[in-house]
Amino acid sequence: APVRSLHCTLRDAQLKSLVMSGPYELKALHLQGQDLEQQVVFSMSFVQGEESNDKIPVALGLKAKNLYLSCVLKDDKPTLQLESVDPKNYPKKKMEKRFVFNKIEINNKLEFESAQFPNWYISTSQAESMPVFLGGTRGGQDITDFTMQFVS
């Protein structure tokens, strides 16, 4: 059975949008008007994972690209990257753990916790045009809350 997916965009709690910054990086910045067309459209796939009553496992691919957000250790630190995959095999219901994020909904906001590295979250900086990264703190300086906008 094909994995169930939806197309969406994400904005952080400061309303910054996510755009490509080079071939394998995302950055967060405020966009308006026609510039909103720059924001990346995600293909969010509902996959197998350590699902709970509060957490839904998803994979976040870039629409029409064979790129997925993944979490790996770099220099002993959990790191967010965009990883290239074989489009013939992805998305799939049984994604490798590094591709899986636990989508957590709290007060109409979303958090994306790495399945590979519990308590590490997709994060953005307060500053403009900084890379999207994997952060190990919630409720601090960095932003871990997002809103999702459906795209048809």
Partner: antibody, heavy 122, light 107 residues
Framework: EVQLQESGPGLVKPSETLSLTCTVS????????VSWIRQPPGKGLEWIGL???????YYNSPLKSRLTISKDNSKSQVSLKLSSVTAADTAVYYC????????????????WGQGTLVTVSS | DIQMTQSPSSLSASVGDRVTITCQTS??????LNWYQQKPGKAPKLLIS???TLRPGVPSRFSGSGSGTDFTFTISSLQPEDFATYYC?????????FGQGTKLEIK
């Protein structure tokens, strides 16, 4: 060798809380999930819920409001608490280990305890 | 939740017979289907996972097939120790759901 052993009182009064413990060996509770399943006398199997290695839980809807699953990794024990029990909760209760193989077989249950009969009666 | 329809609910057969049990799911689950054997007073034992993968130590007379929504469990030549109740389980998504069971009795 993987082993699971359920324990707890065999008799619980209606409206009270059923409390069971599953003690495991041969694997670490921080690495594998554990499910609870029950079987009323002469009937089929019903999956109750599970606790993952992370400590996150998933409770099956019919029991969600009455159910708590927790664990103590250091003691290799998983506990089940079911509140406000009635005669309909009379069953053999099993705990079982999740296969937990990512991208292959995450949700199957490969090893089971021998089960413990809990009777709800005054 | 995924609904499971297992049939027959009971079955009488003789030693040496070939026996087939089917399981249907309410939605496509690929190959995420398991078969368990349960003897009276004992815990279920996993025989087959991923629709057709025989678990270590399980005799080769047991087999499973199918994908999507239709699955089959077969015992090629019944042995006296095979008389038991058999359950299918979908492991595609939570909550996990079992079939109603098939009681295999001696004819």
């Amino acid at each position: 060798e993987v082993q699971l052993q359920e324990s707890g009182p065999g008799l619980v009064k209606p409206s009270e809380t059923l409390s069971l413990t599953c003690t495991v060996s041969g694997f670490s509770l921080s690495d594998y999930g554990v499910s609870w399943i029950r079987q009323p006398p002469g009937k089929g199997l019903e999956w109750i819920g599970l606790i993952w290695g992370s400590g996150d839980t998933y409770y099956n809807s019919p029991l969600k409001s009455r159910l708590t699953i927790s664990k103590d990794n250091s003691k290799s024990q998983v506990s089940l608490k079911l509140s406000s029990v009635t005669a309909a909760d009379t069953a053999v209760y099993y705990c079982a280990k999740q296969t937990n193989i990512w991208a292959y077989d995450l949700y199957s249950m490969d090893y089971w305890g021998q089960g413990t009969l809990v009777t709800v009666s005054s | 939740d995924i609904q499971m329809t297992q049939s027959p609910s009971s079955l009488s057969a003789s030693v040496g017979d070939r026996v087939t049990i089917t399981c249907q799911t309410s939605t496509d689950i690929d190959d995420d289907l398991n078969w368990y054997q349960q003897k009276p007073g004992k815990a279920p034992k996993l025989l087959i996972s991923l629709a057709s993968t025989l678990r270590p130590g399980v005799p080769s007379r047991f087999s499973g097939s199918g994908s999507g929504t239709d699955f089959t469990f077969t015992i090629s030549s019944l042995q006296p120790e095979d008389f038991a109740t058999y359950y299918c389980l979908q492991s595609d998504r939570l909550p996990l759901t079992f079939g109603q069971g098939t009681k295999l009795e001696i004819k």
